[in-house]
Interface confidence: low
């Protein structure tokens, strides 16, 4: 029951997180005009990953895609890429995790398959969250380092007359949305990975496998790592010793490089 709850909660948290990452990527308020020196300005600028906007005191807002002869800076392209990769991985993770949910039965899908899918989606959510956090952090770092030299084109009025105003930009709402959303996706991914451990079919940790020694004694070895997890078992009896005449002490005391198969 706890496993189902952990898995379900992980899914919901990740779903909210990915929705937040999508929202942050689409938002225009990645950087907003710093109004510290001019709190009663007639125009307010804010910029996103895709376009730049200006809002006038009248309420009129105009947004434009970036037009630049130089091409957009590589760092902006990198942030865009990180956010898109985060969204894509998150979306695939959600798709996988829906089929992995314990409360949903699909045909005769085994628990081991669900465990694998849960782990896969969990890892995807973790990477997705990290991508979003990295993208937002890179943007924030650029804003901090270039805080004093950012400029904006301010459109004054419907006619589109333009004047250049030295404007400083500060963190926009999208950055905070991105950080929180990335964090939620990350937490959701961790929860899915935790749930995966509980979903793995339980097998006996000590599968006794006989190994024949030529002497009078018989040594028993546990099945090793593979037998203790649900992801494969050591079913074949493997001869560890070559049948040479050894004493019981020799067999049990000296570890061989073949001891763990």
């Amino acid at each position: 029951m706890a496993v189902t709850a952990c898995q379900g909660l992980g899914f919901v948290v990740s779903l909210i997180g990915i929705a937040g990452i999508i929202a942050a990527t689409c938002m225009d308020q990645w950087s907003t005009q710093d109004l510290y020196n001019n709190p009663v300005t007639a125009v307010f600028n804010y910029q996103g990953l895709w376009r730049s906007c200006v809002r006038e005191s009248s309420g009129f807002t105009e947004c434009r895609g970036y037009f630049t002869l130089l091409g957009l800076p590589a760092m902006l392209q990198a942030v865009r890429a990180l956010m898109i990769v985060g969204i894509v991985l998150g979306a695939i993770g959600l798709l996988v995790s829906i089929f992995a949910l314990k409360c949903i039965r699909i045909g005769s899908m085994e628990d081991s398959a669900k465990a694998n899918m849960t782990l896969t989606s969990g890892i995807m959510f973790i990477v997705s969250g990290l991508c979003a956090i990295a993208g937002v952090s890179v943007f924030a770092n650029m804003l901090v380092t270039n805080f004093w030299m950012s400029t904006a084109n301010m459109y004054t009025g419907m006619g589109g007359m333009v004047q250049t105003v030295q404007t400083r930009y500060t963190f926009g709402a999208a950055l905070f949305v991105g950080w929180v959303a990335g964090g939620l996706t990350l937490i959701g991914g961790v929860m899915m990975c935790i749930a995966c451990r509980g979903l793995a079919p339980e097998e006996t940790n000590y599968k006794a496998v006989s190994y024949h020694a030529s002497g009078h004694s018989v040594a028993y070895k546990p099945g090793g790592f593979k037998a203790s997890t649900g992801f494969g078992s050591n079913t074949k009896n493997k001869k560890i010793y070559d049948g040479g005449a050894r004493t019981e002490d020799e067999v049990q005391s000296y570890p061989s490089k073949h001891d763990y198969v």
Partner: nanobody, 119 residues
Framework: QLQLVESGGGLVQPGGSLRLSCAAS???????MAWYRQAPGKQRELVAG???????NYADSVKGRFTISRDFAKNTVDLQMNSLKPEDTAVYYC??????????????WGQGTQVTVSS
């Protein structure tokens, strides 16, 4: 701070020619200079531009008729407009871009010069 001053606008007949000039005064040399235009009730659009590397960019509607040229020493950009059409009527703005490492290039604009093509 970069100041841009345009000159050369005026009234011209269809098929005529006009040369617009833009002088940039300031300590910094721009990475790219361009001409944009805005017709009444329309959005501002790129006419022609040239980067520091010398690559040019023209609007489809002016290709073959307009030519942009740049003097890096004087920090000026000229737009030679031939075979003018009535649809070329607009306010022409000079633009300079400086890439400072910020996400968005610093963009500077002139006040604009009116070009009217009419018979």
């Amino acid at each position: 701070q970069l100041q841009l001053v345009e000159s050369g606008g005026g009234l011209v007949q269809p098929g005529g020619s006009l040369r617009l000039s833009c002088a940039a005064s300031g300590e910094i040399s721009s990475d790219a200079m361009a001409w944009y235009r805005q017709a009444p009730g329309k959005q501002r659009e790129l006419v022609a531009g040239m980067t520091r590397g010398g690559s040019t960019n023209y609007a489809d509607s002016v290709k073959g008729r307009f030519t942009i040229s740049r003097d890096f020493a004087k920090n000026t950009v000229d737009l030679q407009m031939n075979s003018l059409k009535p649809e070329d009527t607009a306010v022409y703005y000079c633009n300079a871009e400086i890439y400072t490492g910020t996400f968005y290039p610093r963009s500077y604009w002139g006040q604009g010069t009116q070009v009217t093509v009419s018979s």
